[in-house]
Amino acid sequence: SSPTSSASSFSSSAPFLASAVSAQPPLPDQCPALCECSEAARTVKCVNRNLTEVPTDLPAYVRNLFLTGNQLAVLPAGAFARRPPLAELAALNLSGSRLDEVRAGAFEHLPSLRQLDLSHNPLADLSPFAFSGSNASVSAPSPLVELILNHIVPPEDERQNRSFEGMVVAALLAGRALQGLRRLELASNHFLYLPRDVLAQLPSLRHLDLSNNSLVSLTYVSFRNLTHLESLHLEDNALKVLHNGTLAELQGLPHIRVFLDNNPWVCDCHMADMVTWLKETEVVQGKDRLTCAYPEKMRNRVLLELNSADLDCDPILPPSLQTS
């Protein structure tokens, strides 16, 4: 998802010039120390250089900026604000740069920013206004089209005393700034649940990746507002069954493909509707690979091969007959 450069001719800046240059106003199209630049490809790469802050002297032509594999720690307000502004910057990749805090307005003054990748950063503190830039109830629309937030969950001991899901969702919904977002990737974040209001406020979403989380149920999640959703990745979660309401909503989305591999499906009487739906629907990719995990007697049975007689629930014994 993140931008890759087609550049073949990169110029590296000489590190020994850095101190001399920083003492005077930056030249318009110079290449920052420890970076590689290609004006032809409009690309700057400052990769695996242990940078602790965003270079101040980024060339005005930059369209694709890679700041991956660094040690940025904090992204302050206006981290990319420059005079003149970086008006062309469209794709920004900050993955794997040890960011643990992204402050309000960190991406302000980037009028063309379409793609942002913050993956593989332990974001213990993601400001609610990181993407909207202000605490107004309705902010100026963000130009972001793709937001990649895979594996941004910090280690357990570094989390604030609040829900990680809630922190991320607050940033996604603040000021309704992300109404134009088309791709959202939230894979590998240990999400236990999906707050019910998040999808309703991202109506332009075409691609939603929630794979490799810990989602147990979608009962309270509504996909109805995502009228043009094209892909819903739910692989590698803890889903046990999809209920009728969810099945009907998914079936009502004419452009959707749903990815459900590697979930611990429970093949009891509650699975009957889902099995019927799977046999009829075209929206599930690789539906013939879905297998039961529980109960033990059903393990590895293919969902598509089940019939109603296979799907039973043990009767619940009255309390007087239960044994401890």
Partner: antibody, heavy 115, light 107 residues
Framework: EVQLVQSGAEVKKPGATVKISCKVS????????MNWVQQAPGKGLEWIGR????????NYNGKFKGRVTITADTSTDTAYMELSSLRSEDTAVYFC????????WGQGTLVTVSS | DIQMTQSPSSLSASVGDRVTISCRAS??????LNWYQQKPGKTVKLLIY???RLHSGVPSRFSGSGSGTDYTFTISSLQPEDIATYFC?????????FGGGTKLEIK
């Protein structure tokens, strides 16, 4: 912005097969769905079918089913539409259109079927 | 298949006029109704999707409304560059189907 560039005009004999290509660029924000649409001379638009490029899943209009095959090569960001057993009424401009709601269209490829 | 009936098939209007085109589906299409523009000899452009959502870069003089089976496309103030054929299309139920088109001319 997404741009779709189609292959050039073709002249075919009845009974032959034509294969049209459609290359996507500006792919960062392109859709996974690629549709194909027919426009016969002086006529309206008719949907032929679509492919979900990532997994190859296809849907076809029953009118063309059995004669049309839509494929995609993700390594080159190119989609293809092959129409076989051509007849004179297949003479038309064929468009590829990217997106569930067909957000962006190619420039069209004229296919002339004539003996 | 769902039939899409578009009217009128042609219309003539003056610059600055308000222009409306109708599209009726043979069954409920749940707002999955798109409008396209095709200028003579040119490719097709999406203007409006899901009944009323403006596609990126499309001028605000274009709008859409409707529900169920009946939908309307409006140009609030006709401009010379709007001379084109306009098509409606449903993408609720496969196969997708188009209206017959409305050819718009300037008086």
């Amino acid at each position: 912005e997404v741009q779709l560039v189609q292959s050039g005009a073709e002249v075919k004999k009845p009974g032959a097969t034509v294969k049209i290509s459609c290359k996507v660029s500006g792919y960062a924000f392109s859709s996974s769905w690629m549709n194909w649409v027919q426009q016969a001379p002086g006529k309206g638009l008719e949907w032929i079918g679509r492919i979900y490029r990532e997994d190859g899943h296809t849907n076809y209009n029953g009118k063309f089913k059995g004669r049309v095959t839509i494929t995609a090569d993700t390594s080159t960001d190119t989609a293809y539409m092959e129409l076989s057993s051509l007849r004179s009424e297949d003479t038309a401009v064929y468009f590829c259109a990217n997106g569930g709601a067909m957000d962006y269209w190619g420039q069209g490829t004229l296919v002339t079927v004539s003996s | 298949d769902i039939q899409m009936t578009q009217s009128p098939s042609s219309l003539s209007a003056s610059v600055g006029d308000r222009v409306t085109i109708s599209c009726r589906a043979s069954q409920d299409i749940s707002n999955y109704l798109n409008w396209y523009q095709q200028k003579p000899g040119k490719t097709v452009k999406l203007l409006i999707y899901y009944t009323s959502r403006l596609h990126s870069g499309v001028p605000s003089r274009f709008s859409g409304s409707g529900s169920g089976t009946d939908y309307t496309f409006t140009i609030s103030s006709l401009q010379p560059e709007d001379i084109a054929t306009y098509f409606c299309q449903q993408d609720n139920t496969l196969p997708w189907t188009f209206g017959g088109g409305t050819k718009l001319e300037i008086k």
